[in-house]
Interface confidence: low
């Protein structure tokens, strides 16, 4: 029976710079069992290099020197005695680019090296970008823990250095942001910022990175409400408005909060389960009644809380004047005055531009006044 | 060599309290997040309990919250799972497990397990 | 909560067939999924990770694919000392969640 010497492996392989790749491979080579069992020692070699002399890139022999350039970054993986050469690359550097060739040899009659069968290593510029990971939703004021990988990498070589970059870091231990992960308490001022995180090999130039946006969930915190684009001015979640009666009234409710909150606005001080007057966060009264002095409440709805704020409306209405009419009655002339006005109007009596005060007497003139509101009454 | 080693488990009575141990050695114990895995007799995986290098964060599954504490001592490279109010069901082989760190939270190093017995 | 459903839940397989294992997330886990070799009374121990990657020291014959929800491994060639429970788990959200297991059992 012929010799067979035969090596299944890959033509090329392309790998990143500073990433990891395996070649898969397997050989066989004649060997009979009646033989005696000599250990069998397979290399991995640069191309053109006399397997004699030269260091080799990988072997399982112990007593053969091992390139150290190479130490610790191309190692055999799988099990020799079952044929199986496969080698294993990792953090790739531009000076691996090249052929390879695989050796086996056992006792005095195996010594061969599959010329014809060479491994082209090809170490490209790295393209590939670090993924950022967050293990649950950023939400305001929780801590969460994020994590920068890059697939492809392994732990050959020399260890990977991280640097994070960001406006949300700024208050954190320059330390902490040199891990491969990171606990972020993120702020609702920090949605929609930049995150950077780069990876760099110790001692090589090799760097790369991603930039991600953040995207923050955090409940209102403040509620404003807009009249004709101007923010309505709240005190203790109160915000007063004065308004004409008839009027028309358009006001905007916002609530910055991410997602957005649902805004919806409700007459008076409502309870948690009342009808909206509106489901989204505009109020259009086309005209204003004295009746709506009672306000209405604009209610931002998040799922993680929500707030509301009163709008306490001032009813104004345009002054009506009725009379003043005259007339003559038993006890002498009876002079009567009516307006209407809201907030209800005082009213004043004037003899030869003298003021009569109300409910008073001067001499032989007698003034009764009432304010009910709207109306106020004299006579 | 990269290793761990759980120690803590034994026999515990239905509402007691056990502390497992896990000691690392053979690499940098603050760079990886590490958890613990438990297995029921008989039974398929289950994640318990995860946390970050630093400690900072800590994770639960709903079955164990409120009644487990995971903490780790980076100075004495330790991990720890603090157990209390134990049920017949907490009863398993727990191990503590390495984050790779090329994978948030996939574990390339497992500790050989430490059997917690839950039972009256 | 992710659920991981394993399908099958065993199988029986013969040296140097090649076995598919499928796994099935209730939603999408990126490609944050592993899977891992358990033997009887031994520790798990991580095959793939990042759904294709093979973990250093692993023999080639071991392949993970799929995106999304749908991953399958692939043992391309099965040999005597891969008899043994697999188990697939996500790691994109927590809680973490391994799937149910699958028995491969010499025929």
């Known amino acids: 029976e012929k010799p067979v010497y035969e090596l299944q492996v890959q033509k090329s392989v392309t790998v990143q710079e500073g990433l990891c790749v395996l070649v898969p491979c397997s050989f066989s080579y004649p060997w009979r069992s009646w033989y005696s069992s000599p250990p069998l020692y397979v290399y991995w070699f640069r191309d053109g290099e006399i397997p004699y002399y030269a260091e080799v890139v990988a072997t399982n022999n112990p007593d053969r020197r091992v390139k150290p350039e190479t130490q610790g970054r191309f190692r055999l993986l799988g099990d020799v005695q079952k044929k199986n050469c496969s080698l294993s690359i990792g953090d790739a550097r531009m000076e691996d680019t090249g052929s390879y060739f695989f050796r086996v040899e056992r006792g005095r009659d195996v010594k061969y090296s599959y010329q014809q069968n060479k491994l082209n290593l090809e170490v490209t510029a790295l393209i590939e970008k670090p993924d950022i990971h967050f293990l649950e939703p950023l939400e305001s004021g929780r801590p969460t823990r994020l994590s920068c990988s890059l697939p492809g990498s392994c732990e050959a070589g020399p260890p990977l250095t991280f640097s994070w970059t960001g406006n949300a870091l700024s208050p954190l231990d320059p330390e902490t942001t040199r891990s491969s992960e990171l606990t972020l308490t993120p702020r609702p001022e920090d949605h929609g910022t930049n995150l950077t995180c780069q990876m760099k090999r110790q001692g090589a130039q090799v760097t790369t990175e991603r930039t991600v946006q953040l995207n923050v969930s955090y409940a209102p915190q403040t509620i404003t409400i807009f009249r004709n684009g101007i923010a309505l001015e709240i005190l203790q979640n109160t915000s007063y408005l004065p308004v004409l009666e008839g009027q028309a009234l358009r006001l905007l409710c916002d609530a910055p909060s991410n997602p957005p909150a649902h805004l919806s606005w409700f007459q008076g001080s409502p309870a948690l389960n009342a009808t909206p007057i509106s489901n989204t966060g505009i109020l259009e009264l086309r005209r204003v009644r004295s009746a709506e002095k009672g306000g209405f409440t604009c209610r931002a709805q998040h799922p993680l809380g929500f707030l509301q704020i009163f709008l306490n409306l001032s009813v104004y209405s345009l002054p009506q004047l009725l009379g003043p009419s005259c007339s003559w009655e038993a006890e002498g002339l009876h002079c009567r005055c009516s307006f209407r006005a809201w907030p209800a109007p005082s009213l004043c009596w004037r003899l030869e531009e003298k003021p009569l005060e109300g409910n008073s007497s001067q001499g032989s003139f007698k003034v009764n006044s009432s304010s009910p509101g709207p109306w106020a009454n004299s006579s | 060599e990269v290793q761990l080693l759980e120690s803590g488990g034994g026999l515990v009575q239905p509402g007691g309290s056990l502390r497992l141990s896990c000691a690392a050695s053979?690499?940098?114990?603050?760079?990886?997040?590490m958890a613990w895995v438990r297995q029921a007799p008989g039974k398929g995986l289950e994640w318990v309990s995860g946390i970050s290098g630093s400690a900072a964060s800590t994770y639960y599954a709903d079955s164990v919250k409120g009644r487990f504490t995971i903490s780790r001592d980076n100075s004495k490279n330790t991990l720890y799972l603090q157990m209390n109010s134990l049920r017949a069901e907490d009863t398993a082989v727990y191990y503590c497990?390495?984050?790779?760190?090329?994978?948030?939270?996939?574990?390339?190093?497992w500790g050989q397990g430490t059997l917690v017995t839950v039972s009256s | 909560d992710i659920q991981m459903t394993q399908s099958p839940s065993s199988l029986s397989a013969s040296v140097g067939d090649r076995v598919t294992i499928t796994c099935r997330a209730s939603q999408s886990t990126s490609s944050y999924l592993s899977w891992y070799q358990q033997k009887p009374g031994k520790a798990p121990k991580l095959l793939i990770y990042a759904v294709s990657t093979l973990q250093s020291g692993v023999p080639s014959r071991f392949s993970g694919s799929g995106s999304g929800t749908d991953f399958t491994l692939t043992i391309s060639s099965l040999q005597p000392e891969d008899f043994a429970t697999y188990y697939c788990q996500q790691s994109y959200s927590v809680p973490l969640t391994f799937g149910g297991g699958t028995k491969v059992e010499i025929k």
């Open positions: 497990a390495r984050d790779l760190l090329a994978l948030p939270y996939a574990f390339d190093i």
């Open positions: 053979g690499f940098t114990f603050s760079n990886h997040a």
